[in-house]
Structure formats: C-alpha cells, structure tokens
C-alpha cells in the first residue's frame, strides 16, 4: 500500500511540476520592469523567453516575438534549451510512469518491469526538475548582473543636459513558477525512485551453509562478495575464502527490503 501511495503521489507531484515548467516556459513575465519606488507606471515592460511585451497605462498591450535566432544572447538560448529539455524529459517520464503505476494493470507486465519503469521515470523527473531549476537560475543570474550594470549607468547623457532613463528589469512571476515547478518535479522524481525500491521483486534469503573441509573449517557466507568489495560489514583486510560453493542467486543476494502491503 505504501509503495502504491508513494508512486501515485510521486506521479501527481511530477505532473503538477511539469505542468508548471510548461507554464513557466510559455509565460511572458520572466523579467519585469523594475518600478523603483513608483508602483504606477505609464509604460510597463516585461519579457519572456519567446517575446517581449509592453503594457501602457491606457491598457494597450503589445507583444513582439524574438524573430531572430542568431541575434539572441547565448544565455537566453541556453535557458530556452534547458527548459525544452526539461519539458521533453518530463513528458517522456510521465508517459513511462503511467505504464509503471502499480494501480494500472497492462497485460502480464511483471513487477520487475514496473520497478524499472518507475526508476526510469523517476530519474527523468529528477533531471527534468534540475533542468528547469538550472534554466530559471541562469536567467535569474543574468537579470541580477544586468540589474546592477544598469544601476551603475542609471542615467547617461551629455554633460547631464539630456538624460536617458535606462529600463531596469527584475524577477518576473515566471521565475518563481519555474523554481517551484522544478522543485516539485524533482521531489516527484525522488518519490518515484523510492517507490521503485519497494516495487522490486524480493529475492530469496539463503541461509549460510557450512562446508567441512579437511584440516580446517571455514563458514562460507553469501555476503562474502559484499565484504570483499567493502560494502558489507567486513571492511578489514580479512581473507574470505570462496571455494565456488555458491548458487547464482547468492552472487547478487542483498538484504531485501520488506514492504508490508
């Protein structure tokens, strides 16, 4: 029950997150004009990844797309790429996770296949969330840099006679939507990965078998491989004798997680 709930919740959280990433990517308010101390402005500028808009106090709003590709800043292109990669990975992850849901029966799909699919979608969600967070953070960093640069040259003019007010831009709503959405997708992905562990079919626990050899007696444990690689409890340089008396299952025998359904 806990696994199904964790998987279902992970799916829903990721779904909301990806919807948020798509919304943020499409939004026009990635950067908005800084209004200083004046909340009322006659002309309000805001920009997205795909177009820039101007809203006059008259209510008239005009948006213009960035019809050039080569003329755009490399950072903006990078942010676009990160957001698109995030959306694509998230969409694929959603598709995979639908078939991986424990509550949905598709033919005679084994639990091991569902576990693998859950893990795959979980990883995809994690990467998708990270892409969104990275994209939004890169854009935010770009804004902060430009903000302080334009503050430094707030007014430029010839001998102070003619002044040009430089438009400063600050964080737009899309950045916060993107951060939250990326975070949700990441959390959803982690939940899917956790659910995967519980979905994996439980291996048989073999008891230790004693073999009596001539001259001396050594107990051969299935955990010998683990101990020799330093992942088990035996991390010291003790020699583990392996006489080959091991079944195939024993080679990959890890302590199984018991899921109480």
């Amino acid at each position: 029950m806990a696994v199904t709930a964790c998987q279902g919740l992970g799916f829903v959280v990721s779904l909301i997150g990806i919807a948020g990433i798509i919304a943020a990517t499409c939004m026009d308010q990635w950067s908005t004009q800084d209004l200083y101390n004046n909340p009322v402005t006659a002309v309000f500028n805001y920009q997205g990844l795909w177009r820039s808009c101007v809203r006059e106090s008259s209510g008239f709003t005009e948006c213009r797309g960035y019809f050039t590709l080569l003329g755009l800043p490399a950072m903006l292109q990078a942010v676009r790429a990160l957001m698109i990669v995030g959306i694509v990975l998230g969409a694929i992850g959603l598709l995979v996770s639908i078939f991986a849901l424990k509550c949905i029966r598709i033919g005679s799909m084994e639990d091991s296949a569902k576990a693998n699919m859950t893990l795959t979608s979980g990883i995809m969600f994690i990467v998708s969330g990270l892409c969104a967070i990275a994209g939004v953070s890169v854009f935010a960093n770009m804004l902060v840099t430009n903000f302080w640069m334009s503050t430094a040259n707030m007014y430029t003019g010839m001998g102070g006679m003619v002044q040009t007010v430089q438009t400063r831009y600050t964080f737009g709503a899309a950045l916060f939507v993107g951060w939250v959405a990326g975070g949700l997708t990441l959390i959803g992905g982690v939940m899917m990965c956790i659910a995967c562990r519980g979905l994996a079919p439980e291996e048989t626990n073999y008891k230790a078998v004693s073999y009596h050899a001539s001259g001396h007696s050594v107990a051969y444990k299935p955990g010998g491989f683990k101990a020799s690689t330093g992942f088990g409890s035996n991390t010291k340089n003790k020699k583990i004798y392996d006489g080959g008396a091991r079944t195939e299952d024993e080679v990959q025998s890890y302590p199984s997680k018991h899921d109480y359904v």
Partner: antibody
C-alpha cells in the same frame, strides 16, 4: 458617439471647496482611465491625476496631492474631482480626458471654469 | 519630472506653406521595449479643449488630415504641417506620455502671415 460632459462654471471664495463632475457616455466607462488636466489662462496644461473607474485606483501628480481628490460614481458613469482650500492660483479651466493607446487623450470634456475670487 | 520645451513660442506662416514646430524633452521618451517614442501632439483652438493629432511621435490619430505629420526620436521631436490651412490656426502642445506625471510643453501659437 463618445462624449465627456462636464459640470458648469463655478465661482468660489478662497478657502472653499468645489466639486467638478464629468459624465461619460458612448463607451464602456469602466474600461478607460479618466484623467484630469488643469489649464490656467495663457499657461501650459498641467496633469492633475487619474482614476480607474473599474478598480477605483488613483494616481496623483505630487503637486496636486492634498489639493485634488478624484472619485467616481460607477452607476452614473461619472467621475468627480474635488478641489479643496481654494486659492487664487486655482483659478483655471479643468478638463477631464479619456486615456487611449499611446497614453494619449483622445476625448476631452468641454472644460469647467473655476474662478476663485473674494 | 520630464520638462518639455517647445520652440518657437509663436510662428507665422503663409497659407499653403510648411509649418514646423519643435519639441525637446529633458529625458528620452523612447521605450526600449517596443522602440516607440511616447510623445503626443495636440491642437487647441480658442475656447475649445485640446484635440489629439499625433501619438507615438509619428502615428496620426484617425480623422486627422495627412498634412499633419510627426517625427523625431529620443528627446527631439517635430510636428510638421505640410501645407498650412486657415483652420490650422491654433496653439499646439507636445506631451510626455512616457512617465508620470505627464507633462506638456508651453505651447506654440501658430498664426497666418
């Protein structure tokens, strides 16, 4: 046809108050900002402030804060401007004007002359 | 506040001749977001309210004769009447429509020579 009809001329004593009205017709009153402009004889036009008939939000020129108060009656499609503590320099023609694309005033009231005289 | 300065204060032009009125702002009225100049021109005849002629520095309001044209960018703007008619006698004002408070020029009185 869009029309902005203002109230008639007023003669007031110094220290008194006056309320000028501007009735709008021929368009959706709540969709456009209503602005008020002052014009003293032989002087340049001065922007007083604005009010949005839908939200009721206002924005004033610092120079007129405390002097002018903008209100409205949505049901009557009428905007009001009250001028308080009148002085001789408040003698002017006051216009209401509708803001349109380009932040320009496309329709103006006929003007209300306020004369402050003792 | 943005200061708008018009020149000349008064202008006398013969009928059919070209009339040019200049307007200078203390700050740029060019908005980088849409590359539009937020400058408006009005015509005011005695006893009447101002009439909108041109907005965005060069866009003529509907119903305004095409002899009226606006030009300029940033801080320097011009209103041109290509062929003066008798009904064009009026006071012309330029207005900053870019930042609050909106400000107007002192006006240019256009007369017939």
């Amino acid at each position: 046809e869009v029309q902005l009809v203002q109230s008639g001329a007023e003669v007031k004593k110094p220290g008194a108050s006056v309320k000028v009205s501007c009735k709008a017709s021929g368009y959706t009153f709540t969709s456009y900002w209503m602005h008020w402009v002052k014009q003293r004889p032989g002087q340049r036009l001065e922007w007083i402030g604005m009010i949005h008939p839908n939200s009721g939000s206002t924005n004033y020129n610092e120079k007129f804060k405390g002097k002018a108060t903008l209100t409205l009656d949505k049901s009557a499609s009428t905007a009001y401007m009250e001028l308080s503590s009148l002085r001789s320099e408040d003698t002017a023609v006051y216009y209401c004007a509708r803001l349109k694309t380009g932040n320009s005033f496309d329709y103006w009231g006929q003007g209300t002359t306020v004369t402050v005289s003792s | 506040d943005i200061v708008m300065t018009q020149s000349p204060d008064s202008l006398a032009v013969s009928l059919g001749e070209r009339a040019t009125i200049n307007c200078k702002s203390s700050q740029s009225l060019l908005n980088s977001g849409n590359q539009k100049n937020y400058l408006t021109w009005y015509q005011q005849k005695p006893g009447q309210p101002p009439k909108l002629l041109i907005y965005w520095a060069s866009t003529r309001e509907s119903g305004v004769p095409d002899r009226f044209s606006g030009s300029g960018s940033g801080t320097d703007f011009t209103l041109t009447i290509s062929s003066l008619q008798a009904e064009d006698v009026a006071v012309y004002y330029c207005q900053n429509a870019y930042t609050y408070p909106f400000t107007f020029g002192q006006g240019t009185k256009l007369e017939i020579k």
